[in-house]
């Protein structure tokens, strides 16, 4: 048959951050091509990345339609130049991915401190509300729009002159913290979804310190 040298895809892996979602697999193709299909548990299969020699497929457009759904993908293997050919059972070779629920599993991207403003002994630290590729009414939603109060941020802050750290949490994108007058502080934030059991925390944001560009000081 024409499928003699065709091998099934394996190690199907979802790579997803802030809902940007790519399915990856192995092996690098030798004389074969791949097509990916994706569906929800109750939905129809939709084909993507037709007859590709890549070993990844961007499925973001499909999963953002409903990030709370659970998705399954499968990767079909075809002989290069003979994509009509089927396996011995009359079906092309394919392998299923693990199930993937974007809302529960997408990684939280590294947050960014948008600004901080000092007024006397208070500092307001604002976290950038990152835009996702999830849409509602033709507009892209932010991370906060999607997760609502399920998303919190943890702030770490410390005096530039010392190593002793403090922490604060917020269920918005802003922190209002007390600081000692005349001291410079450094800040780093982390996104957290406390209700999750996996992929709960982001990596820390880059550290921002008072006396640098992003800050503003008022007596």
């Amino acid at each position: 048959s024409g499928t003699t040298n065709t091998v099934a895809a394996y190690n199907l892996t979802w790579k997803s951050t802030n809902f940007k979602t790519i399915l990856e697999w192995e092996p690098k193709p030798v004389n074969q091509v791949y097509t990916v299909q994706i569906s929800t548990k109750s939905g129809d299969w939709k084909s993507k990345c037709f007859y590709t020699t890549d070993t990844e497929c961007d499925l973001t457009d499909e999963i953002v339609k409903d990030v709370k759904q659970t998705y399954l993908a499968r990767v079909f293997s075809y002989p290069a130049g003979n994509v009509e050919s089927t396996g011995s059972a009359g079906e092309p070779l394919y392998e299923n991915s693990p199930e993937f629920t974007p809302y529960l599993e997408t990684n939280l991207g590294q947050p960014t401190i948008q600004s901080f403003e000092q007024v006397g002994t208070k500092v307001n630290v604002t976290v950038e509300d990152e835009r996702t590729l999830v849409r509602r009414n033709n507009t892209f939603l932010s991370l906060r729009d999607v997760f609502g109060k399920d998303l919190i941020y943890t702030l770490y802050y410390w005096k530039s002159s010392s190593s002793g750290k403090k922490t604060a949490k917020t269920n918005t994108n802003e922190f209002l913290i007390d600081v000692d007058k005349g001291e410079n502080y450094c800040f780093s934030v982390q996104a957290v979804i406390p209700s999750r059991t996996v992929n709960r925390k982001s990596t820390d944001s880059p550290v921002e310190c008072m006396g640098q560009e992003k800050g503003e000081f008022r007596e």
């Epitope: 922490t167 949490k169 269920n171 979804i193 209700s195 820390d204």
Partner: antibody, heavy 117, light 107 residues
Framework: EVQLQQSGTNLVRPGALVKLSCKGS????????MHWVKQRPEQGLEWIGG????????MYDPKFQGKASITADTSSNTAYLQLSSLTSEDTAVYFC??????????WGQGTSVTVSS | DIQMTQSPSSLSASVGDRVTITCKAS??????LSWYQQKPGKAPKLLIY???SLADGVPSRFSGSGSGTDYTLTISSLQPEDFATYYC?????????FGGGTKVEIK
């Protein structure tokens, strides 16, 4: 099943130091925050400090700064509390607890430390 | 630092009574408040998280309410196993602070 298993009872001399351990099972400590809480006999609960095992950040109540040192070893899924220059004031039960972000949701069984000459 | 004032420090009640314990924070803690039950010789047990959410396995007679600076734990109908000490904890900002505790005793 999520569990926090703490090390055993300690009887130590004044001026000594002690290192308490708290081994997590059923979860990965670097996905959470780990805290230590002190309870003296017949007294309330006092937060000593906490640690984010993912990045090594540790925070302390100012009254325990210099007394306590909180660390974590992600390879063994264990959090540690070291107490130095022990006095009778440090005689207490010490609890470790996991912080989900919403609460300290799981607690160890407690470790008793008695400082006596 | 945020102070947590818990009241009453003790109360006597009968089985079936409705019991209310309050915690007042010295500043807004944005619902980062949890409630714990502790029995002698045991570790604290989580009852309520994020001010109003019931922890897994906790009977529905326990409920939490409040926001901003004022929070309440209610036991709608006290049961024999509920006689214990109760603590609130604010974890919105370090240093985290516990309330002083409320000992619920049998009348």
């Amino acid at each position: 099943e999520v569990q926090l298993q703490q090390s055993g009872t300690n009887l130590v001399r004044p001026g000594a130091l002690v290192k308490l351990s708290c081994k997590g099972s059923g979860f990965n400590i670097k996905d959470y925050y780990m805290h230590w809480v002190k309870q003296r006999p017949e007294q309330g609960l006092e937060w000593i400090g906490g640690n984010d095992p993912a990045n090594g950040h540790s925070m302390y109540d100012p009254k325990f700064q210099g007394k306590a040192s909180i660390t974590a070893d992600t390879s063994s899924n264990t959090a540690y509390l070291q107490l130095s220059s022990l006095t009778s004031e440090d005689t207490a039960v010490y609890f470790c607890a996991r912080d989900s972000g919403y609460a300290m949701d799981y607690w160890g069984q407690g470790t008793s430390v008695t400082v006596s000459s | 630092d945020i102070q947590m004032t818990q009241s009453p420090s003790s109360l006597s009640a009968s089985v079936g009574d409705r019991v209310t314990i309050t915690c007042k924070a010295s500043q807004d803690i944005k619902s980062f408040l949890s409630w714990y039950q502790q029995k002698p010789g045991k570790a604290p047990k989580l009852l309520i998280y994020y001010a109003t959410s019931l922890a897994d396995g906790v009977p529905s007679r326990f409920s939490g309410s409040g926001s901003g600076t004022d929070y309440t734990l209610t036991i709608s109908s006290l049961q024999p196993e509920d006689f214990a000490t109760y603590y609130c904890l604010q974890h919105g900002e370090s240093p985290y602070t516990f309330g002083g505790g409320t000992k619920v005793e049998i009348k």
